[in-house]
Interface confidence: low
């Protein structure tokens, strides 16, 4: 039934960067300035989105695909397509609701974006904290006294802590 | 510390699709873009496109859009490069780089893999 | 998309000499350029960032400058480790676009 119904219909035969226009019989029209559809069949094209204030322009909106946003120095992009922009702080500290705040003791953060983790908990892993954690960098765990032999790696650094999430390239 | 292995030299015949490696080790593998660029004999370099690992998220020159294909394994951290029908066009030198965030720079590049396409 | 252009492909110069290598956009990238060293064995190392910012573990003789679309590299005590190509890249807009180039050779 669907493909029948698409071959009735002559909206299906117009291509991505165009719609069917119901007002010239329904003919195919280009999408008019600062607009785009990114799909055949469309009956109205979508209005591109503005890159502005805080977000700059990482792709120009082209009459098949939308524009895409990051965000100027100073700040990195949340959520999905960039759709907010928060505020960096140095690398040993977190945004808060006050603005950017130093980590607590016990803490650090070795990016600008992100919230303060915990140090790594060395004795845990039944290691010795061979280099103390700052407010930017985790600690170094090293073998317990046990382990150091002849040949032996002194140095296990942990994992760093990075947020995933996605970030415009 | 980072580092972006690439194997020295691959040969291919034209026409035969092929992928070429970058493994990744020093650094939390998908918190970094990976970037492809290009560099035919004696010439400049050229951006092919790159890849978030996290989501595999891609961007690519339209230039190239037909040509490379960018994909990621995360468990081995490693990101590889699909050339689609390769000609002698495409014989060159090809350095993967990584890019941190937004318009930062390509901090650390790969030795690059010298690949030959002939018959 | 933005072209990047090094008016000089190649350039000679004595040790000890002060270098400065161009570099121009087709428009304004905001400062967003970035500079590269590629040794003759194909090697390729970030010196700086950011117009002006030095990438760690690079030698304080190398330093950057300019706005707008015009940008330069200056190295001010050319020592033989030096000898490499340098590119400029533009980091404001997709696609990233590189200059052709700048050989730098010993007289």
């Known amino acids: 039934f669907e493909r029948t119904r698409s071959l009735q219909d002559p909206c299906s035969n117009c291509p991505a960067g165009t719609f069917c226009d119901n007002n010239r019989n329904q003919i195919c029209s280009p999408c008019p300035p600062n607009s785009f559809s990114s799909a055949g069949g469309q009956r109205t094209c979508d209005i591109c989105r503005q890159c502005k204030g805080v977000f700059r322009t990482r792709k120009e909106c082209s009459s098949t695909s939308n524009a895409e946003c990051d965000c100027t120095p100073g700040f990195h992009c949340l959520g999905a397509g960039c759709s907010m922009c928060e505020q960096d702080c140095k690398q040993g500290q977190e945004l808060t609701k006050k603005g950017c705040k130093d980590c607590c003791f016990g803490t650090f953060n070795d990016q600008k974006r992100g919230i303060c983790r915990p140090w790594t908990n060395c004795s845990l892993d039944g290691k010795s904290v061979l280099v103390n954690g700052t407010k930017e960098r985790d600690v170094v765990c090293g073998p317990s006294p046990a382990d150091l032999s002849p040949g032996a790696s002194s140095v296990t650094p942990p994992a760093p802590a990075r947020e995933p999430g996605h970030s415009p390239q | 510390q980072v580092q972006l292995q690439q194997p020295g030299a691959e040969l291919v015949r034209p026409g035969a699709s092929m992928k070429l490696s970058c493994k990744a080790s020093g650094y939390t593998f998908t918190s970094y873009w990976i970037n492809w660029v290009k560099q035919r004999p004696g010439q400049g370099l050229e951006w092919i496109g790159n890849i978030y690992p996290s989501d595999s998220y891609t961007n690519y020159n339209q230039k190239f859009k037909d040509k490379a294909t960018l994909t990621v394994d995360k468990s081995s951290s490693t990101a590889y490069m699909q050339l689609s029908s390769p000609t002698s066009e495409d014989s060159a030198v090809y350095y993967c780089t990584r890019l941190y965030y937004g318009s930062s720079p390509f901090d650390y590049w790969g030795q690059g893999t010298t690949l030959t396409v002939s018959s | 998309d933005i072209q990047m252009t090094q008016t000089t492909s190649s350039l000679s110069a004595s040790l000890g000499d002060r270098v400065t290598i161009s570099c121009r956009a087709s428009q304004d990238i905001s400062n967003y350029l970035n500079w590269y060293q590629q040794k003759p064995d194909g090697t390729v190392k970030l010196l700086i960032y950011h117009t002006s910012r030095l990438h760690s573990g690079v030698p304080p003789r190398f330093s950057g400058s300019g706005s707008g679309t015009n940008y330069s590299l200056t190295i001010s005590n050319l020592e033989q480790e030096d000898i490499a190509t340098y590119f400029c890249?533009?980091?404001?807009?997709?696609?990233?676009?590189f200059g052709g180039g700048t050989k730098l050779e010993i007289k």
């Open positions: 890249q533009q980091g404001h807009t997709l696609p990233r676009t």
